[in-house]
């Protein structure tokens, strides 16, 4: 299709080489299409957009994204050629930074129903470059935590070194929706609720004599509880003896609850104690079986191919630890009579 009629937008992604970060492009279609396609949830049942040219498609993305090769080759379908770029409704998510993301990205409606639709497209010229080392050391992270129930703030990483007074006007989005209540380089939250969690995008305009660019940064905001003050507790095994059949295979499961910690390094190990010998057992990796805001339940199993007489003399010890402390639970095997 002819892209010469597409509206054009220039964006700059200055990524930090010190941290992982994502980037997002919005398909900023002309308003009638945009409201119908990308933000259906914002329309009340009585509100009807001025123009409804496209069919609602449940199983296909609402818009199609392409990348324009610099050598003039035909447009490339993003989904087929770029596995690190994810198409999601009306957004394009870049999972990894890098100058190789520099280029022109075009979006247009998936369903073309009228000649009007052919001109309905947006071309985004994206320039990607590493942030200069001169940038301040304390720039805000692209992953920010808000403590539930307290006050907090979300800072725009590309502007966090500037005072509010020198900061340009900022446009904020949360999960793709425009936030109109603030134009400053940080959002102040009076009381943090779970719904404050999400993907925030901050944009500001940078101009020189030749052209103007939208500088964009993406912040993943997580709402968290305070760090636990408790050591983990073992939920299973409950009993200190376990009835078993000799010669049969046996799996002993250790399940423990770890309270939330911002820096979470849970330890879960199985040991065998045999007289004055103690050693760590090589067992399958631990796995998380339930995760909530407040805690996480982790399980690790010890597997015996067949229970021997020797196993009856041993003690099997599950050991769990977090930054606060550790807990153990011992299990002795007893032959079923």
């Amino acid at each position: 299709f002819n892209i010469s009629g597409c509206s054009t937008k220039k964006l700059l992604w200055a990524y930090s080489t010190r941290s992982e970060e994502e980037f997002i492009l919005f398909c900023d279609l002309p308003e009638p299409q945009k409201s119908h396609f990308c933000h259906r949830s914002q329309l009340s049942p009585t509100q009807v957009p001025d123009h409804l040219p496209f069919t609602d498609s449940k199983d296909l993305p609402d818009v199609q994204w392409y990348r324009q090769p610099s050598n003039g080759d035909p447009l490339e379908d993003i989904r087929k050629s770029y596995p690190h770029i994810i198409q999601d409704k009306c957004t394009l998510r870049f999972l990894t930074p890098g100058v190789n993301n520099t280029g022109s990205y075009i979006c247009r409606p998936k369903m073309i129903k009228s000649p009007y639709d052919l001109a309905c497209c947006v071309k985004m010229i994206l320039e990607v470059k590493p942030q200069s080392n001169a940038s301040c050391e304390n720039s805000a992270s692209h992953k920010q935590d808000l403590l539930l129930g307290s006050t907090g703030s979300i800072s725009c990483p590309s502007l966090s070194c500037q005072s509010d007074a020198q900061s340009p006007e900022v446009t904020w989005y949360k999960n793709g929706k425009l936030l109109s209540m603030t134009r400053s380089n940080r959002i102040v939250v009076d009381e943090v609720y779970i719904y404050h969690q999400g993907t925030y995008v901050c944009d500001y305009t940078q101009s020189d004599t030749a052209s103007s660019w939208t500088v964009r940064a993406v912040v993943q905001v997580r709402t968290i509880v305070g760090d636990t003050k408790l050591k983990p507790d073992i939920l299973d095994p409950v009993e200190s003896t376990l009835e078993v059949e000799l010669g049969k295979p046996l799996t002993i499961s250790c399940k423990a609850r770890f309270g939330f910690e911002r820096v979470f390094n849970p330890v879960m190990k199985w040991y065998i104690k045999d007289a004055d010998l103690e050693w760590e057992v090589s067992v399958p990796e631990a796995k998380s079986i339930k995760s909530t805001l407040k805690d996480e339940i982790i399980e690790r199993n010890i597997i015996l191919e067949k229970v021997t007489q020797r196993d009856l003399r041993r003690t099997f010890v599950c050991f769990v630890q977090n930054s606060i402390g550790n807990t153990t639970q011992s299990v002795q095997l007893k032959e079923k009579r």
Epitope: K269, D274, D276, E278, W279, E280, V317, F319, N326, T328
Partner: nanobody
């Protein structure tokens, strides 16, 4: 800080013998259990043999009768005598010391390759 340094690995033909040594330095205690684990390419880590300060031992079924573990408490050294080596014994052998639950030390490992 405990450091465990292994030596004695190498290339050996099936049926041959090797003796691995592990010297422990730092705050290692003669009360600590010591031993050997191994990790074959693409496999998980498995316990080969462990020994207590009093000389009690335990072996993996796959090495029983072929491997012998011993230790010199005065020198803080543990040995693994490996006889009748097989191709399936090919692995990185790591020295192990256990102080108490949650306090385990590991060496860098020494490669044993059994091949004709």
């Amino acid at each position: 800080e405990v450091q465990l340094v292994e030596s004695g690995g190498g290339l050996i033909q099936p049926g041959g013998s090797l003796r691995l040594s592990c010297a422990a330095s730092g705050s290692i205690s003669s009360r600590d259990t010591m031993g050997w684990y191994r990790q074959a390419p693409g496999k998980g880590r498995e316990m080969v043999s462990v020994i207590s300060s009093s000389g009690n031992t335990n072996y993996a079924d796959s090495v029983l009768g072929r491997f012998t573990i011993s230790r010199d408490n005065a020198k803080n050294t543990v040995y693994l005598q490996m006889n009748a080596l097989r191709a399936e014994d090919t692995a990185v052998y790591k020295c192990y010391a256990h102080r108490t639950y949650g306090v385990d030390y590991w060496g860098q490992g020494t490669l044993v390759t059994v091949s004709s």
